[in-house]
């Protein structure tokens, strides 16, 4: 999570701004918070949401009249509870389409406070390891987001391919060959933001069993 805080002093109202990157696993719930300002001091709380390929939409709450307005219908984005209780934004089940920027603007008599979130969605790749030719193994991290990194123990003569998909996920395929005959077991290590996974396989004289993990 990256944070970046700036304060701008205008002649009218100062703006305090915080920028944050959040990574959320697909299918989970996301809670985005505004500045910690007592609601009694707030005049207007507005969430501005910019998702890729869609016009920006807003969810606003006027404190004095306790009125709620939204133009973000059909996106599964709501207040976490009632905004007079807590101005947090909730995404009940994050999808790849929820990637984008979420800005909470809080207007107070003392000035404006802005919290920006860059929401990145993570997808766990499906990992498989198998031997496909004599002393050659293939490790794949299928449809992850972002792309996984594949490494081998021991190191071999390797070639790696990446493929990008229409939903924003990436498949990484690493094919390795071991000429040295004293190498009998090899391990594929897949590093990913959602967690790391290691699989091992015995190099058989003929193509052997297939290992897989999710």
């Amino acid at each position: 999570t990256d944070k970046n805080q700036t304060t701008q002093n205008n002649s009218s109202s100062p703006l305090t701004q915080v920028n944050t990157t959040v990574s959320v696993q697909i299918g989970t719930k996301a809670l985005l918070c505004c500045f910690s300002i007592p609601l009694t001091k707030a005049v207007l709380i507005t969430w501005i949401i910019k998702l890729r390929g869609l016009p920006s939409c807003t969810i606003a709450y006027k404190v004095d009249t306790k009125t709620n307005e939204t133009s973000c219908l059909g996106r599964n984005i709501t207040w976490a509870s009632t905004p007079d209780h807590s101005p947090e934004l909730q995404i009940s089940a994050v999808t790849l389409q929820h990637e984008g920027t979420y800005t909470c603007e809080t207007v107070t008599p003392e000035g404006n406070f802005e919290k920006n979130y860059d929401l990145q969605v993570l997808v766990t790749p499906e990992v498989t390891l198998f031997q496909n030719r004599n002393r050659t193994a293939v490790c794949k991290a299928v449809a992850g987001k972002p792309a996984a990194h594949i490494s081998w123990i021991p190191e071999g003569d390797c070639a790696t391919k990446q493929e990008y998909w229409s939903n924003g996920t990436v498949t990484v395929k690493s094919t390795c060959h071991w000429e040295v005959h004293n190498v009998s077991t090899v391990t594929c290590h897949v590093s990913h933001l959602t967690g790391n996974k290691s699989l091992y396989i015995e190099l058989l004289p003929v193509p052997g069993a297939k290992k897989s993990a999710k």
């Epitope: 496909n132 299928v142 493929e163 939903n167």
Partner: antibody, heavy 119, light 108 residues
Framework: QVQLQQPGAELVKPGAPVKLSCKAS????????MNWVKQRPGRGLEWIGR????????HYNQKFKDKATLTVDKSSSTAYIQLSSLTSEDSAVYYC????????????WGQGTLVTVSA | ENVLTQSPAIMSASPGEKVTMTCSAS?????MLWYQQKSSTSPKLWIY???KLASGVPGRFSGSGSGNSYSLTISSMEAEDVGTYYC???????????FGGGTKLEIK
């Protein structure tokens, strides 16, 4: 520049098999997947399957798994599709197309081979 | 399998007219590709990443959309734009490439 060369046409008798070729040049053959796409006259495009030339790993559209077999010859940078037991339904243009890398699709296509199944 | 439905199937436009065709996906996508195919030739990559024009594609073409709904627009129809346009998606898990049924564009 990248080129995928295919023969223009093949005439095949019903029930017979046919093997079509696609010769690649202008890039490292083993670095990209080779796909095959079918187009019947006046119809749309259908993905048949693909092969990784580096290790011959294949993926097939379920619709074509009993009809098509994909192979490669790395030494000549050529991909092949064998179609079995041909019927009139198999009369079509068959394209090879390269995929892989940053684009979730096919940046380069062959000119296509027209297969006509006729007695 | 993600089904791509294109509409209209056939359309005609006069020179200079604005043209819009759509592609609806049964499952949500992040990016859409479009191919142009002229009579008796192989398809050409036309638009990628939803809105980026492939090399050599005239600036009158544009692409837009998100989620399940995408469109290709020609700001001012020209004779050379005649052909069939296919939307396309690639899925990594399960692995499948899918084309829309195509929109055949004719000139009046």
């Amino acid at each position: 520049q990248v080129q995928l060369q295919q023969p223009g046409a093949e005439l095949v008798k019903p029930g017979a098999p046919v093997k079509l070729s696609c010769k690649a040049s202008g890039y490292t053959f083993t670095s990209y997947w080779m796909n095959w796409v079918k187009q019947r006259p006046g119809r749309g495009l259908e993905w048949i399957g693909r092969i990784d030339p580096s290790d011959s790993e294949t993926h097939y559209n379920q619709k074509f798994k009993d009809k098509a077999t994909l192979t490669v010859d790395k030494s000549s940078s050529t991909a092949y599709i064998q179609l079995s037991s041909l019927t009139s339904e198999d009369s079509a243009v068959y394209y090879c197309a390269r995929s892989g890398g940053w684009l979730p699709g096919f940046a380069y296509w062959g000119q296509g081979t027209l297969v006509t199944v006729s007695a | 399998e993600n089904v791509l439905t294109q509409s209209p199937a056939i359309m005609s436009a006069s020179p200079g007219e604005k043209v819009t065709m759509t592609c609806s996906a049964s499952s949500s996508l992040s990016y859409m590709l479009w191919y142009q195919q002229k009579s008796s030739t192989s398809p050409k990559l036309w638009i990628y990443d939803t809105s980026k024009l492939a090399s050599g594609v005239p600036g009158r073409f544009s692409g837009s959309g998100s989620g399940n709904s995408y469109s290709l627009t020609i700001s001012s129809m020209e004779a050379e734009d005649v052909g069939t346009y296919y939307c396309f998606q690639g899925s990594g898990n399960p692995l499948m490439y899918t084309f829309g049924g195509g929109t055949k564009l004719e000139i009046k």
